[in-house]
């Protein structure tokens, strides 16, 4: 199990790419328009 | 209007230092991300970071990561990177782009050139 | 990273007659929200990118339906209806959907 695990990860693969791949959605969404789905869109005065 | 306005670019050695900043003005600058994107002269375009709206989220390129850091205010409107240990292959037109509804950069500045040259 | 493909990278077209771009990427641009955030951009002649689509097929606010997007997955493609004198310039594939956000090469279009 543990050796399966390991060879993953030293599959061309690190942590932090992982991370980005898996980074939630709430998350992701705060990098562009953040209100977009919760108060309708726009964002302009 | 919507619109960013990017300044600070110039002509630097490399090795040194330079703080750009991008303006924004006509909408809601705290409720979008922003992001910096490149040009190289004659070149095609390539994203370099974001900073999430309220700047607890960032991300980099590995081309400056470790070297570059994004930042904002949002009391003054305004997004900043602050480029360290600049390379020659540095050298481009650094463009502020707003992350807009769809995942999209809808918004562009005009640009600032930085030029890292001995 | 994702790797983003576009062909032609140069492409003369004659004025009123159509256009079209193909756009590739390496892996699947369908993000776990069930979109796909790619985009399409133009830049002309000394001057900064402007958003045309956004993911896939949506006309930005301004941009003129001779321009649409369509695609899924890993293939993508910008067409103009029209060519017109003030479509010169290279337009751009971009891929929103993972870190690190990437850019296709871009395609050239100009008049014959």
């Known amino acids: 199990k543990h050796k399966c695990f390991r060879n993953s990860l030293e599959n061309n693969e690190t942590l932090e790419s992982i991370m980005n791949t898996l980074e939630s959605e709430e998350d992701f969404r705060k990098y562009f328009y953040y209100l977009e789905g919760s108060k309708g869109g726009g964002g302009s005065k | 209007q919507v619109q960013v306005v990017e300044s600070g670019g110039g002509v630097v050695q490399p090795g040194r230092s330079l703080r750009l900043s991008c303006a924004a003005s006509?909408?809601?600058?705290?409720?979008?991300?922003m992001h910096w994107v490149r040009q190289a002269p004659g070149k095609g375009l390539e994203w370099v970071t974001v900073?999430?709206?309220?700047?607890?989220?960032?991300n980099y390129a590995d081309s400056v990561k470790g070297r570059f850091t994004i930042s904002r205010d949002n009391s003054k409107n305004t997004l900043y990177l602050q480029m360290n240990s600049l390379r020659a292959e540095d050298t481009a037109m650094y463009y502020c782009?707003?992350?807009?509804?769809?995942?999209?950069?809808?918004?562009w500045g005009q640009g600032t050139m930085v030029t890292v040259s001995s | 990273d994702i790797v983003m493909t576009q062909t032609p990278l140069s492409s003369p077209v004659t004025l009123g007659q159509p256009a079209s771009i193909s756009c590739r990427s390496s892996?699947?641009?369908?993000?776990?929200?069930?979109?796909?955030?790619l985009s399409w951009l133009q830049q002309r002649p000394g001057q900064p990118p402007r958003l045309l689509i956004y993911?896939?097929?949506n006309r930005f606010s301004g941009v003129p339906d001779r321009f649409s997007g369509s695609g899924a997955g890993t293939d993508f493609t910008l067409k103009i209806s029209r060519v017109e004198a003030d479509d010169v310039g290279v337009y751009y594939c971009?891929?929103?959907?993972?870190?690190?956000?990437?850019f296709g090469p871009g395609t050239k279009v100009d008049i014959k």
């Open positions: 782009a707003r992350g807009g509804s769809g995942f999209a950069f809808d918004i």
């Open positions: 006509g909408f809601t600058f705290s409720n979008y991300g």
């Open positions: 900073i999430s709206y309220d700047g607890s989220n960032k």
């Open positions: 892996q699947s641009l369908v993000r776990s929200d069930g979109n796909t955030y």
């Open positions: 993911k896939i097929s």
């Open positions: 971009m891929q929103t959907t993972q870190f690190p956000f990437t």
